[in-house]
């Protein structure tokens, strides 16, 4: 009779993340009587994943049954594949010895991939507001897919952009991969309502990418435009002066009036108007008492916004 | 605003049978008015889908809010897909109009495969049974698959075969297709315990290839050989002649002695020895009186096996 | 919640002006073409213009020329600018929203009363 | 212009009944056609458009259908609530026009 091979009729077999695996395997003889083995690796370090003869291996299960005399199928089947379980196949037959079998005839082997899905993409944006006509960086991760390969874009609004870098780690064979994008986007005025979003495609998601989105109203801080103006009163020793604060975001802005320097009153903005881009706008109004004054009187109207240094805008205010 | 587009990004997508297709679609403006509609194919005999402004669409689920006159998504999911649902899926939009709507512009078009599983493969033999050293062929099937892109191998007894011709129609495009393969195989004495396996890889089969098989015992005759014998005897007027009928295939034998060409004795095969080879063993004996013999008798053991043609073995008793 | 509020309206002589205006809440005010209808006390409804997102317009021969659309995204705002009035431009004047897929209006404001008198 | 002839013009029923009022355009207007429904003192409320279709939070009650030039609306069981003048409007192309209006009132 011919001499026994080891058939692993499949080079590779690929499967998704949390189904089974089988690993076929046949014996053209019956003949040397001894066990078979199934060894993820070669050489020294190669790890045993079934051993015929003796043992305890819940994920897996024969397709045949090898306790038959006639049997010559070996093929096994590994149930909840992990990317972990990535990884060569060796189905191997030892001969029947003492004090220990000894190896006989190894399969070629059955490369097993495994199909994992990228987790959710974060996308994270900078730490400290920027204002408009300033570039942020904003980074996407995803991580624990498998194939390597795996297309990133970015969009900005629904328009894709094309400033950005991506890494795929790490460079060499691995059981599953990560994937870091950092994106660099111009802010506008407009941007309060925008949004950036990260999208990623991967054999494993059968053409429904995922999505991570942030809001750029997190990164942007678009500074108020100041206008002071005196408003027509009927009392004659009374000026009304106000001061219109112009699309702002972030909220937060703390308004102080000084006549000719000196402080005369303090407001933090409470109730704004939320204009249709997203931004605020505030008005505070100051009466003054020109029976109080001999000469020409310099408002300031002085805001600080976001904790950032304070603009102005002065009036001079005619007492005749 | 610039001229509405109609984007269809995806140009092919893939569906395992029975599961959900999405197809995307966007539009890039909101004007002008008019309704969108789904169809599979182009031109005159295209297949209407999904029509936005009336019709009832058990399958057809859209992904978003389509009444709302701000949508601009008109992306749909198809349920329970199968290979008649194969095509190029066109997104039109039409522009409101009277006594019809009017076609205002169409999506590039996304082409739905559709991934089916081939059939169980069934495997023929021949019609009537052949000897050893004779060639038979087999023929396998698999039907209703879907890519075309299918591959077939022959095993006997776990070992590949190359004498075989496969076609895969039809040759043109379809919604599924079907194999067929006749494979030609040399029977030898052994082959009665042998299998041959047809083994059909295929893209939804995930490296787990479907098998049909057949055994060679339903199209090999072994014929038996004869060897007739004398037995030694302590009774001096009888002889014991055997007829040990070797390694023959099916069971089917009939047996009849023949002393100087004059039927003595007709026997059917009953209990039979099994060889490891599957073949069968049967012995036949015959007491011969030598006291009714004045001269030589020629005795023939004729063996008539499955019908066929009988063939006979002769021995020459002496009488002394 | 979706919402639209007329304004502006009032008593106004033969020949005269008003500007009606219709604010609108709860929605993207931009991506909807947006109608004025009126009804004269007793009477059925009539459309009287429409402006659509891309701001074109139009108007039926009844207001063509007298009365203008017009509308500020930023502000959510559609306005009717009515010049030349006549007696028979007597109404309750409503804004509605073409909202959905086809156009149809879905949303309409309460009114708001314009008389043209002596 | 396209013309809108209702009918009828006004119409007693009682409670629970099932009523039709119809529509009819000078000239084909597809299905672009709605269906309001407006009582006195009050803004009009869409109920139906392209002709067949249900506006949100409208009660299945309310049914249209026709297409080309003929259209109807029926209220399959009549409420207190649903007395009112209802009017049909086509939208196809503009001018878009009402008809004059049927006033349903309670028998």
């Known amino acids: 009779e011919d001499e026994l091979q080891v058939i692993q009729p499949e080079k590779s077999v690929s499967v998704a993340a949390g189904e089974s695996a089988t690993l076929r395997c046949a014996m053209t003889s019956l003949i040397p009587v001894g066990p078979i083995m199934w060894f993820r690796g070669a050489g020294a370090g190669r790890e045993l994943i079934y051993n015929q003869k003796e043992g305890h291996f819940p994920r897996v299960t024969t397709v045949s049954e090898l306790t038959k005399r006639n049997n010559l199928d070996f093929s096994i089947s590994i149930s909840n594949i992990t990317p972990a379980d990535a990884g060569t196949y060796y189905c191997v037959k030892f001969r029947k010895g003492s004090p220990d079998d000894v190896e006989f005839k190894s399969g070629a082997g059955t490369e097993l991939s495994v199909r994992a899905k990228p987790s959710a993409p974060v996308v994270s944006g900078p730490a400290v507001r920027a204002t408009p006509e300033h570039t942020v960086s904003f980074t996407c991760e995803s991580h624990g897919f498998s194939p390597r390969d795996i297309t990133l874009k970015w969009f900005k609004n629904g328009n894709e952009l094309s400033d950005f870098q991506t890494n795929v780690d790490p460079a060499g064979d691995s059981v599953s991969y990560s994937i870091h994008s950092t994106a660099r986007v111009v802010l506008t005025r407009g941007d309060v309502h925008s949004q950036v979003i990260c999208e990623i495609a991967h054999i494993t998601l059968q053409g429904d990418p995922l999505r991570g989105t942030a809001n750029l109203s997190e990164a942007i801080r678009v500074p108020p435009t100041l206008e002071v103006t005196q408003q027509p009163m009927r009392a004659e020793n009374q000026a009304n002066v106000t001061c219109q604060v112009s699309n702002f975001y972030p909220r937060g802005l703390q308004l102080t009036w000084l006549e000719n320097g000196n402080v005369s009153r303090t407001e933090t903005a409470s109730t704004l108007i939320e204009n249709k881009d997203g931004t605020y706008n505030w008005m505070s109004w100051l009466l003054v008492n020109t029976c109080a004054h001999r000469d020409d009187v310099v408002l300031t109207c002085q805001v600080e916004h976001d904790g950032q240094q304070a603009v102005s805008k002065s009036y001079a205010l005619e007492i005749s | 605003e610039d001229e509405l587009q109609v984007i269809q990004p995806e140009k092919s997508v893939s569906v395992a049978a029975g599961e959900s297709a999405t197809l995307r679609c966007a539009m890039t403006s909101l004007i002008p008015v008019g309704p969108i509609m789904w169809f599979r194919g182009a031109g005159a005999g295209r297949e209407l889908i999904y029509n936005q402004k009336e019709g009832h669409f058990p399958r057809v689920t859209t992904v978003s809010e389509l009444t709302k006159r701000n949508n601009l998504d008109f992306s749909i999911s198809i349920s329970n897909i199968t290979p008649a649902d194969a095509g190029t899926y066109y997104c039109v939009k039409f522009r409101k109009g009277s006594p019809d709507d009017v076609e205002f512009k169409s999506g590039a078009g996304t082409e739905l495969s559709v991934r089916a599983k081939p059939s169980a493969p069934v495997v023929s033999g021949p019609a009537v049974r052949a000897t050893p050293e004779h060639t038979v062929s087999f023929t396998c099937e698999s039907h209703g698959f879907s890519p075309r892109d299918i591959t077939l191998k022959w095993f006997k007894n776990g070992n590949e075969l190359s004498d075989f011709q496969t076609n895969v129609d039809p040759a043109g495009d379809s919604v599924s297709y079907s194999i067929h393969s006749t494979a030609r195989v040399v029977l030898t004495r052994g082959d009665v315990h042998s299998q041959v396996i047809c083994e059909i890889a295929h893209i939804t089969l995930q490296g787990d290839p479907l098998r049909g098989t057949a055994n060679l015992s339903e199209a090999i005759r072994v014929p038996p050989t004869l060897e007739v014998t004398q037995q030694p005897m302590r009774a001096e007027n009888q002889a014991n002649v055997t007829c040990q009928v070797s390694n023959f295939y099916p069971r089917g034998l009939q047996l009849t002695w023949l002393e100087n060409g004059n039927v003595s004795r007709t026997e059917t095969a009953s209990t039979l020895i099994e060889n490891k080879d599957g073949t069968y063993n049967w012995m036949s004996w015959l007491l011969v009186n030598t006291c009714a013999h004045r001269d030589d008798v020629v005795l023939t053991c004729q063996v008539e096996h499955d019908g066929q043609q009988a063939v006979s073995k002769s021995y020459a008793l002496e009488i002394s | 919640e979706v919402q639209l509020v007329e304004s502006g309206g009032g008593l106004v002589q033969p020949g005269g002006s008003l500007r009606l205006s219709c604010a609108a809440s709860?929605?993207?005010?931009?991506?909807?073409?947006m109608h004025w209808v009126r009804q004269a006390t007793g009477k059925g409804l009539e459309w009287v213009s429409v402006i659509g997102i891309a701001g074109d317009t139009y108007y039926p021969g009844s207001v063509k020329g007298r009365f203008t659309i017009s509308r500020e995204n930023a502000k959510n705002s559609l306005y009717l600018q009515m010049n030349s009035l006549r007696v028979g431009d007597t109404a309750v004047y409503y804004c509605?929203?073409?909202?959905?897929?086809?156009?149809?209006?879905?949303?309409w404001g309460q009114g708001t009363m314009v008389t043209v008198s002596s | 212009d396209i013309q809108m002839t209702q009918s009828p013009s006004s119409l007693s029923a009682s409670i629970g009944d099932k009523v039709t009022i119809t529509c009819r355009a000078s000239q084909d207007i597809n299905n672009y056609l709605a269906w309001f429904q407006q009582k006195p003192g009050k803004a009009p409320k869409s109920l139906i458009y392209t002709a067949s279709s249900l506006q949100s939070g409208v009660p299945s009650k309310f049914s249209g259908s026709g297409s080309g030039t003929d259209f109807t609306l029926t209220i399959s069981s009549l409420q207190p609530e649903d007395f009112a003048t209802y009017y049909c409007?086509?939208?196809?192309?503009?001018?878009?026009?009402f008809g004059q209006g049927t006033k349903l009132e309670i028998k």
């Open positions: 709860g929605f993207t005010f931009s991506s909807y073409d």
């Open positions: 409007q086509q939208y196809v192309s503009y001018p878009y026009t």
């Open positions: 509605a929203r073409g909202g959905s897929w086809d156009d149809a209006f879905d949303i």
